[in-house]
Structures are given as C-alpha cells and as structure tokens.
C-alpha cells in the first residue's frame, strides 16, 4: 500500500512528506527512517528534526524544502541500488500514539545506457528494443525496455517486527494529524 517513487542510479531521489504547522515556526519533530514505520518511533533513523532545526542527519540524506513551513521531504543524494526499499516519514505531534506515519517505497533502476552517437546504428540493429520507454508511477522515468527489472532482495528492516517495547528515547512521544492546530 506504499506510494512508489523511482530514481536512477547516480541521481538524487526525492521522497515527499509534508505537514501544516499550526503557526509559522510552530514546528513538530519529524523522523525519517529506513524501513516501514514501526509501531513507535522510526527504525534505522537517517534524519531527524526537532521543534527548531534538523538535529540529526547522515551523509547523503537531507531536506531540500523549507522544513520550517512543513516541507520535510527527503532527498537522497547519488542513489545506488542499495537505497531501494521502504522509507518512513513520521510526524510526531504531541499527544498519545498519534503519529502521522507515511511509508514510501523507493525503487532504484540501473542508469540508462547512452550509446555513443557513432555506434548508434550498430547498437540498435543488435538490440532493436533497447530504446523502448516505459513510464513508472509518480515520478516517471525512462528505462531500457529489453532489460529485465533487477530483482532486488528486500533489505531487512524493523518494519516487519513491530516492536512491543519502545526504545527509551524522547522521539517516541507522539504525533497527530497532518494538519496541526
């Protein structure tokens, strides 16, 4: 049931996530994790914000939008096949067990093969279907039609092991509706 987003190896991937702050600057904590949203918190956290700022991030993961206006969309720089999988955006609004949780599926495709112009005729003669294009999901990309999709082994996450007991840290608090206030 996750929404699917696509990118090619070497590109930046974009995973959208938004909320509406009750008032300008009235921010709530958000965490991004690799793996579907567990019952509590984020598993395998890659980026985290608090009420004021981004307070934790790992290399290649950043917020490109204006997170102070509720744009907490994640950008992953220079993706590889290993970046494929489910990501959790968790909006942690104060309260009891009211997190807004969004699971987004990132599919990474191999980079397009761009043949050298002088070899074009030979290339297309040998591979007549190579220039077929196919559209994919929310972020449409072009792929080489005759190449099989890479069958990626799903990266194991905490997602399927909904934790009965939470980690004792401050980010398990809460969270609520996407519109705050």
């Amino acid at each position: 049931s996750e929404v699917e987003y696509r990118a090619e190896v070497g590109q930046n991937a974009y995973l959208p996530c938004f909320y509406t702050p009750a008032a300008p600057g009235n921010l709530v904590p958000v965490c991004w994790g690799k793996g579907a949203c567990p019952v509590f918190e984020c598993g395998n956290v890659v980026l985290r914000t608090d009420e004021r700022d981004v307070n934790y991030w790992t290399s290649r993961y950043w917020l490109n939008g204006d997170f102070r206006k509720g744009d907490v969309s994640l950008t992953i720089e220079n993706v590889t096949l290993a970046d494929s999988g489910i990501y959790c955006c968790r909006i942690q609004i104060p309260g009891i067990m009211n997190d807004e949780k969004f699971n987004l599926k990132l599919v990474i495709k191999p980079a397009k093969v761009t043949p050298a112009p002088t070899r074009q005729r030979d290339f297309t003669a040998a591979f007549p279907r190579m220039l077929t294009t196919r559209g994919h999901g929310p972020a449409e990309t072009q792929t080489l039609g005759s190449l099989p999709d890479i069958n990626l082994t799903q990266i194991s996450t905490l997602a399927n092991e909904l934790r009965d007991s939470r980690l004792a840290n401050d980010l398990r608090d809460s969270g609520a509706t996407i519109r705050i206030g």
């Epitope: 019952v39 807004e100 949780k101 009965d164 007991s165 004792a168 809460s174 609520a176």
Partner: antibody, heavy 113, light 107 residues
C-alpha cells in the same frame, strides 16, 4: 476536524458475534493508529487492541486475542472490531480512538439472552 | 503485561482543594504515561501525556509528574467541573494498560 463515529452495537445473544464500525473523518485515515477500548458498566477502561490502517498491522490484549479481530476498509475510512463468542462479561461500551487523543462517542454492546 | 496500580479508588474534596492521584507501574515505563478525565456517559479526554506534558487547551491547574515506576497527577485548585473519574495509562509497551480509575467527588 477529527471525528470518529462508532456503530453496530446492540443486543446480542451469548455465543453470538458482532462487528462494530468506526467511521473516521477529518484526517488521513491510512496514516494514523486506531485503538479500541471498552468499558463495562460502572467499571474502568480496558484496552482491546491497535491497528495501523496503512498496512493492517495489529496488536491485541492477550485476554481478547482469540475473540477480537481488528480490520480496516481504507476506501471507506472505516475501522472494524469483530467480536466472537460473546459472553455476558463482554457487555460494555466500546470506543475507538485515533491514537488515544481523539475518541468516538462509544457504542453499547449488551450480551444477554 | 505491565500492571498499573492507581490510588485512591475514590476521593472527596472541596472546591479549591489540591487533589493528588498516584499511579505505580509494575516496571519502568520511561515516562510513557498519560492521564485521562472521563465524565459520565462521555468518552475519555486526554489531559496529560509523557507524564508531565499538558495537552493544548487543558487548564493549567492540571499537572503531572514522575518517572520510572511512580507517577502523580495533581489538580492544584479543584473546580466543580473537575468532577469526573481519572485514569492513568501506560503506553510504553503493548498491551497498553490503564489504572483502575479514581472517582473524584465534591464534598
């Protein structure tokens, strides 16, 4: 505005079954937890279980695990509690809640012959 | 399962009094404790979450404190509209468990 409206309560024979509905509105149904809680007449609150509509994950209180089943219909923004093998002691008001901050009004289930 | 022992089960106080209710968990719940107010025929209403954080819109006369296994809920100056039953809840782990409730009455 977040709203939860329960329905489906009423009189049930011992040994019977009942499916309660919880219609949600005013928020993104698939992204928030739903909890079910019940309260027998004159008694305290008892947590029944939890479901995340986004992926259908569930948790139950051990004493009701074999009797209660939680589910959702994302197209209808509705959560369901199915209760089987009902006994007199299952007579209670049943509440659904978005997280545990927004509650429905409750629906009364009476188990009696 | 985590047991929540709430006391007293009932209490009678006068308008303006300071009222205190306690909840003890059978193990450390890392301050993942909420307090609810329930009036007859109504759904519970969240007052406090994370042991000491007041829900927006709840009067400041309500407060919570505690850590580990021991938690306290206080009404600094009892008002007539505070007559209700109060429950604690631990949400540190499943199954979630409520205290038995404290019925508050006016003298």
């Amino acid at each position: 505005e977040v709203q939860l409206v329960e329905s489906g309560g009423g009189l049930v024979q011992p040994g019977g079954s009942l499916r309660l509905s919880c219609a949600a509105s005013g928020y993104t149904f698939t992204s928030s937890d739903i909890n079910w809680v019940r309260q027998a007449p004159g008694k305290g609150l008892v947590w029944i279980g939890w479901i995340f509509p986004g992926d259908g994950s569930t948790k139950y209180t051990p004493s009701l695990k074999d009797q209660a089943t939680l589910s959702t219909d994302k197209a209808k923004n509705t959560a369901y509690l199915q209760m089987n093998s009902l006994r007199a002691e299952d007579t209670a008001v049943y509440f659904c809640a978005r997280g545990l901050d927004y509650w429905g009004q409750g629906t009364l289930v009476t188990v009696s012959s | 399962d985590i047991q929540m022992t709430q006391s007293p089960s009932s209490l009678s106080a006068s308008v303006g009094d300071r009222v205190t209710i306690t909840c003890k968990a059978s193990q450390d719940i890392n301050s993942y404790l909420g307090w609810f107010q329930q009036k007859p025929g109504k759904a519970p209403k969240t007052l406090i979450y994370r042991a000491d954080r007041l829900v927006d819109g709840v009067p400041s006369r309500f407060s919570g404190s505690g850590s580990g296994q021991d938690y306290t809920f206080t009404i600094s100056s009892l008002q007539p509209e505070d007559i209700a039953t109060y429950y604690c809840l631990q949400y540190d782990e499943f199954p979630l468990t409520f205290g038995q409730g404290t019925k508050l009455e006016i003298k």
